[in-house]
């Protein structure tokens, strides 16, 4: 009988230990959840405040309407210029309207004067059609003045108020474009 009682007591003690362990685990889990919650809230807070403080365009970029523009300070060939823009989360400039062209040429006059700047325009070798890098056609008023007699690939660039064409392997400055951040706060 005594042996039976001590066996029951041992089982109860074992049960108690298991329950204590479970409680300890639960407390630990609860604490971890609270910490994660705190971290999440802090992260959300930071994200919201940085979004609130962030300007529509990065530093050294120029804003016009929904676009941000970056005027390079280095020369490169057309293809490398495109890759340089992609590294900044942008593409070579795509001019959609005369108003945008006027803004660009006006800004360039203020910044640098009369240099050559690659834009995202190239001439298809087979058809001879001019196309922007996303595959769309330029509006009739924004076709490059024929200047290049190159047998190589021909790309578009801006100089003063004009859109011109040149061998894509020549070195020029370039202009990148990305969409401005919309303020959602």
């Amino acid at each position: 009988k005594l042996l039976q009682v001590s066996t029951i007591a041992m089982q109860q003690q074992e049960k108690l230990i298991q329950q204590e362990r479970a409680l300890l685990n639960f407390t630990e889990w609860k604490r971890s959840c609270a910490l994660q919650m705190k971290y999440c809230q802090a992260f959300m807070q930071n994200s919201l405040s940085s979004a609130h403080n962030s300007s529509p365009c990065p530093n050294n970029w120029i804003q016009n309407r929904e676009s941000c523009y970056y005027v390079s300070e280095i020369w490169s060939i057309w293809h490398t210029s495109q890759e340089n823009c992609l590294k900044e989360g942008s593409t070579l400039l795509q001019i959609e309207s005369k108003e945008e062209m006027d803004f660009i040429t006006g800004s360039l006059r203020k910044i640098k004067g009369s240099y050559d700047y690659w834009v995202g325009l190239s001439q298809d070798g087979h058809s001879g059609r001019w196309l922007w890098q996303d595959g769309s056609s330029p509006s009739p008023g924004l076709l490059p003045a024929e200047r290049s007699q190159s047998a190589n690939q021909v790309c578009g660039y801006v100089k003063s108020n004009s859109l011109l064409s040149s061998n894509c392997s020549t070195w020029k400055y370039f202009i990148c474009e990305k969409y401005a951040l919309r303020s959602s706060v």
Epitope: E83, L86, K87, E88, G89, S90, Q133, E177, K178, Y179
Partner: nanobody
């Protein structure tokens, strides 16, 4: 560190279609744009198409693929796709996925073979 895993390559007849996928695994916060390059035997690696990572994305295509190839992305899956239609023998190459990064080395995938032949 980010790993880029390409898939979807294979053998296709001229005029056929293929869709390549590039899944980015790891901390992709630093990636500013994703691109597809290709390299045919004895030729230089060339940019085929790219898409920027911002919510309002911008795209760029090589002249030779405009109107035939379309680049897109699924942010939820961290995956970029290249839909290739009207494939021609000259599209035969190893296609590589690239993750562009500002002020740092870019990430490259291992490549997937695309062969266009009858």
């Amino acid at each position: 560190q980010v790993q880029l895993q390409e898939s979807g390559g294979g053998l296709v007849q001229p005029g056929g279609s293929l869709r390549l996928s590039c899944a980015a695994i790891g901390n992709i916060a630093s990636i500013t744009a994703m691109g597809w390059y290709r390299q045919a035997p004895g030729k230089q690696r060339e940019l085929v198409a790219a898409i920027t990572s911002a919510s309002a994305s911008r795209t760029t295509y090589a002249d030779s693929v405009k109107g035939r190839f379309t680049i897109s992305r699924d942010n939820a899956k961290n995956t970029v796709y290249l839909q290739m239609n009207s494939l021609q023998p000259e599209d035969t190459a190893v296609y590589y996925c690239k993750g562009f990064r500002s002020g740092a080395d870019d990430y490259w995938g291992q490549g997937t073979q695309v062969t266009v032949s009858s």
